[in-house]
């Protein structure tokens, strides 16, 4: 049953019974002020009512104070991500206080029991914050709680219980089981801090979603749709870990939220931008690359405060590792005539040529279907900064390049043996960069030749800046 507590919320760690000579019971929640980047350095332990450690360990009352809150643990020890986060915070904010909330005895339980312990841990953090507020110069507005997985909900409880309002809570893939659909007072929610930003990296509609799917902050960012993270597939994991299994995939995707946050601290010159969108599918279509009216934001530490009336779901693509930044492009292709399209969707690829670099051949993901006499929108992204775009190569994959298409082509031929060549006509491609918000129009090199068919390519050159529309604001966000 859920772990019992005394009036102080303290508990003997039953997993590691103290030696007979030990009289002092370790508190179940400890506050470790990290005074060094070195994970081997013990730091200082703070406790409510004891001011000496604050002086001994040079706690800076006027500086930012970060509380790092771990989640459920099967191992009962701190994992590597925590040391990386501590180090990154020290690197970025040299004067800040970095406090690790150690609730391992209560987290090193059955997951469900650990969930039932989150409330008391939140209370302990709130008590610590209430005590610190009694000190001169300490401001709750300078407090930033960073909670991973179950720790995100602990942060929510702390923000809810504290006297006043903490400056910021960052939820790093808040835990899903037992919190999905829960009442706002029983999970992380926007009213737990002045600004609540959330990264969702392991959400699933099948199986058990380890990360919470629902939005729980002022901004909720879903990198790569919030589910399949690049570099975390079973094949990727199998390559690096003996007996790679689904648990390694879960850990990789769930923990990706932490690494995205660390990336935002250490690679501040390479910020990743997320874009507001109603859902992942619309984002994949390339519809949502606007920065107007706060519709885009930096992710992680550099996120600018947005307190929307309604929750803001935001999306972005990332690389498989640090630095995670990619460059997003919206491509609008107006197909003005179709010829003998049959039942199969064309498979298009684009190559972008820029002043700094050329992209790899990038697939155009057709989310639904190609519409004729209509503008079709696509999302493409590159890992490198191409600079200013100069030209675009559009290729229609020949049927023989895909077994599935070859089969459909063959079926199409059987039903319509005299079906002449398939083609479609494209005069121009309009491109918008998510990162710079620049709009460009590309026209076919030969105005007389606008048709493309399987196995062929079409070249487009920049023919004008803009889309003959009012320019949108740039996402160049003032970094804190």
């Amino acid at each position: 049953s859920p772990v019992p507590f005394g009036p102080e919320g303290r508990l003997e760690d039953k997993l590691h019974k103290p030696k007979a000579t030990q009289t002092e019971v370790k508190p179940s929640v400890r506050f470790n002020l990290r005074t060094s980047k070195d994970p081997e350095h013990e730091g200082c332990y703070l406790s409510v009512g004891h001011s000496q450690p604050l002086e001994d360990c040079s706690f800076n009352m006027t500086a930012k104070t970060f509380f790092i809150i771990h989640g459920w643990t099967m191992s009962g020890i701190f994992e590597n991500w925590l040391h990386k986060l501590v180090s990154a915070l020290h690197t970025r904010e040299k004067d800040a206080n970095v406090v690790v909330v150690d609730w391992l005895p209560l987290a090193h339980q059955l997951y469900t029991d650990a969930v039932n312990n989150t409330r008391v841990v939140g209370h302990s953090i709130a008590r610590m914050l209430d005590w610190l507020q009694e000190k001169d110069d300490f401001s709750l507005g300078n407090v930033h709680l960073i909670g991973y997985s179950l720790g995100a909900h602990v942060a929510g409880y702390a923000g809810n219980f504290v006297k006043g309002t903490v400056g910021r809570i960052t939820g790093l893939d808040p835990a899903g089981p037992m919190f999905e659909g829960a009442d706002i007072h029983k999970r992380l929610s926007p009213d737990d801090a002045d600004f609540v930003d959330v990264l969702h990296t392991y959400t699933r509609s099948f199986g058990l979603s380890i990360g919470i799917q629902m939005p729980v902050g002022h901004i909720d960012i879903y990198p790569n749709g919030g589910d399949f993270q690049p570099g975390c597939g079973l094949n990727d994991v199998l390559g690096s870990i003996a007996y790679g299994t689904i648990t390694e995939v879960v850990k990789c995707e769930h923990e990706r939220a932490v690494h995205l946050f660390v990336d935002s601290l250490v690679n501040q010159d390479k910020p990743s931008f997320a874009f507001q969108c109603t859902d992942s599918n619309r984002f994949k279509k390339g519809i949502c690359l606007s920065c107007r009216k706060n519709r885009c934001n930096s992710i992680g530490y550099n996120a600018k405060k947005m307190r929307n009336k309604r929750n803001s779901k935001m999306y972005l693509k990332t690389r498989a590792g640090m630095p995670f930044r990619v460059y997003h492009y919206q491509m609008k292709i107006h197909v003005f005539s179709y010829k003998n399209m049959g039942e199969i969707e064309p498979t298009f690829y684009v190559t972008l040529y820029g002043t700094n670099a050329d992209s790899q051949t990038l697939p155009l993901e057709i989310v639904e279907r190609i519409e004729q006499n209509a503008t079709n929108t696509f999302l493409v992204y590159t890992e490198e900064d191409l600079g200013d775009l100069l030209k675009i190569q559009l290729t229609w994959e020949g049927a023989s390049q895909s077994w599935y298409n070859l089969w459909k082509e063959f079926r199409s031929y059987l039903s319509q043996p005299r079906n002449p060549g398939r083609e479609l006509n494209i005069r121009r491609i309009r491109v918008k960069s998510g990162e710079t918000q620049r709009k460009l129009t590309f026209c076919t090199e030969d105005p007389e030749n606008t048709s493309i068919s399987p196995g062929r390519e079409l070249w487009f050159r920049k023919c004008r800046d803009g889309w003959r529309m009012k320019n949108e604001t740039s996402p160049t966000v003032e970094l804190p």
Epitope: S1, P2, L15, H16, M74, S75, G76, I77, H108, L110, Y111, T112, D113, N116, P177, M178, L208, I210, I241, A242, Y243, G244, T245, T247, E248, V250
Partner: antibody, heavy 119, light 107 residues
Framework: QVQLQQSGAELVKPGASVRLSCKAS????????IHWVKQRSGQGLEWIGW????????KYNEKFKDKATLTADKSSRTVYMELSRLTSEDSAVYFC????????????WGQGTLVTVSA | DIQMTQTTSSLSASLGDRVTISCRAS??????LNWYQQQPDGTVKLLIY???RLHSGVPSRFSGSGSGTDYSLTISNLEQEDIATYFC?????????FGGGTNLEIK
Amino acid sequence: QVQLQQSGAELVKPGASVRLSCKASGYTFTKYTIHWVKQRSGQGLEWIGWFYPGSDSIKYNEKFKDKATLTADKSSRTVYMELSRLTSEDSAVYFCARHEEYTNSLAYWGQGTLVTVSA
Amino acid sequence: DIQMTQTTSSLSASLGDRVTISCRASQDISNYLNWYQQQPDGTVKLLIYYTSRLHSGVPSRFSGSGSGTDYSLTISNLEQEDIATYFCQQGYTLPWTFGGGTNLEIK
């Protein structure tokens, strides 16, 4: 694929002890908890306890804490359960099974070891 | 400890039938309910975890539902290989506890 191979049947005398083994293969041994479950003839299942090789942490069902002792040998990827002071009540099939995190289910089971306590 | 009750200890059905086995917990277990199949040779397999999620490799004729304290396992189209004993288990809190089992046989 994931496999849990249990040791063979045991016939033991009352008051004696017995050590059962469960050898794991097909996954990272230190990343999953191994549970032990008891099934008396024609009856239901009873959870005995767990052993987590990643940190050697152990949890027992209060009912079995003076009966079972769980240990492991990481080098051979094997978890052991020693049953002491055996009585006829301990005659049963004992299963080891692997815990799935978050779902709190036992996704893979050994074939079971029959322990018969008889004079 | 949480008590798990499978009221029906034995159930007869014909091949092709839709069969439902129920399980009740003595308190709310927040969907942490798993179903296992024990075949006549003693082999135990996980069928359903977290109330309704199908374990990999389990045929889609098996499904689970429920919430709070009441849960059920349904086999939509009974096949010969489904003749076995079915156990429910709560994973909500320690000690984990199992239902007494429901033995499914052919009419």
